[in-house]
């Protein structure tokens, strides 16, 4: 899980420190998880497609009083510092399924690792 150095970056694209750091933070969260993450709080699942960073931020921001994910919230803000337009928000908020924060983090981590391997840093 922690061996990010093993990810191959295709072509001349330089590795993204921002994506790497986000992955490392999510790895830390999953590995250091003793009690249920954020007391088992539930968040809306998201489509791991275009607009994923903003959607992930919008979902995780609704978990209050959980210091374990505040750094993740702030790191996601780096990818999505300004609100997307009102029209784009409808696609971000497909609010039909709730999952535990721990599962959300694991799903996000797996997807980000895939993006990193493929060199999709933005």
């Amino acid at each position: 899980l922690t061996c990010l150095g093993g990810f191959a970056s295709p072509g001349p694209v330089p590795p993204s420190t921002a994506l790497r750091e986000l992955i490392e933070e999510l790895v830390n969260i999953t590995q250091n998880q003793k009690a249920p993450l954020c007391n088992g709080s539930m968040v809306w699942s998201i489509n791991l497609t275009a607009g994923m960073y903003c959607a992930a931020l919008e979902s995780l921001i609704n978990v209050s009083g959980c210091s374990a994910i505040e750094k993740t919230q702030r790191m996601l803000s780096g990818f999505c510092p300004h609100k997307v337009s009102a029209g784009q928000f409808s696609s971000l908020h497909v609010r039909d399924t709730k999952i535990e924060v721990a599962q959300f983090v694991k799903d996000l981590l797996l997807h980000l690792k895939k993006l990193f391997r493929e060199g999709q840093f933005n």
């Epitope: 420190t17 990818f79 933005n122």
Partner: antibody, heavy 118, light 111 residues
Framework: EVQLVESGGGLVQPGGSLRLSCAAS????????MSWVRQAPGKGLEWVAS???????YYPDSVKGRFTISRDNAKNSLYLQMNSLRAEDTAVYYC????????????WGRGTLVTVSS | DIQMTQSPSSLSASVGDRVTITCRAS??????????VHWYQQKPGKAPKLLIY???SLETGVPSRFSGSGSGTDFTLTISSLQPEDFATYYC?????????FGGGTKVEIK
């Protein structure tokens, strides 16, 4: 300790160009969005530009097409290229770490003064 | 653009006083239950400093005498007991809509 140090300000004639720089230290620069905010003499604050970690840029209409924000993560530096400068662009320009619409502008530099005058 | 109107524009107060500054947005700056308003302090010749984010969350390292409240269009920054180092200008800012906009500022002076 987080530090943001702006440079490149000075006197420029209307219609001229200037490039501001911001040197960042004390944090992982490439992992944060960044912004420029300006303050005309004796006036309030005005947001000028932002850039995400993925290099998406954002501008208000007042500078769109004239100003360009960019970053060089290898040099831990943020830039603002200002073209077609007007008298109303005269201000202290601050570089700020932008932690997004939920968290605000969390760290600021001391600013650099840009004066547009003939 | 969303206009942020602060009042008063200036006030005089003494050390130990309770100080309240208000900020009114021209339209709601609430977003899915969060109020996207932030408060900054600026001393003469210095850079602004973030005090409060998301209307009522205290930024790390900021003294607890500062607090924020409000939702929708009306927001308040309160200093429970004014200290000598609190004499400065305070700005509100909204991030609910581009362009991000600031209030005109409230200068807190020594009485």
């Amino acid at each position: 300790e987080v530090q943001l140090v702006e440079s490149g300000g000075g006197l420029v004639q209307p219609g001229g160009s200037l490039r501001l720089s911001c040197a960042a230290s004390g944090f992982t620069f490439s992992s944060y969005a960044m912004s420029w905010v300006r303050q005309a003499p004796g006036k309030g604050l005005e947001w000028v530009a932002s850039i995400s970690t993925g290099d998406t840029t954002y501008y208000p209409d007042s500078v769109k097409g004239r100003f360009t924000i960019s970053r060089d993560n290898a040099k831990n530096s943020l830039y603002l290229q200002m073209n077609s400068l007007r008298a109303e662009d005269t201000a202290v320009y601050y570089c700020a770490r932008n932690e997004g619409y939920y968290f605000g502008l969390t760290q600021w530099g001391r600013g650099t003064l840009v004066t547009v005058s003939s | 653009d969303i206009q942020m109107t602060q009042s008063p524009s200036s006030l005089s107060a003494s050390v130990g006083d309770r100080v309240t500054i208000t900020c009114r947005a021209s339209e709601s700056v609430d977003h899915f239950g969060w109020s996207l308003v932030h408060w900054y302090q600026q001393k003469p010749g210095k850079a602004p400093k973030l005090l409060i984010y998301r209307a009522d969350s205290l930024e790390t390292g900021v003294p607890s005498r500062f607090s924020g409240s409000g939702s929708g269009t009306d927001f308040t920054l309160t200093i429970s007991s004014l200290q000598p180092e609190d004499f400065a200008t305070y700005y509100c800012q909204q991030s609910n809509e581009d362009p991000w906009t600031f209030g005109g500022g409230t200068k807190v002076e020594i009485k």
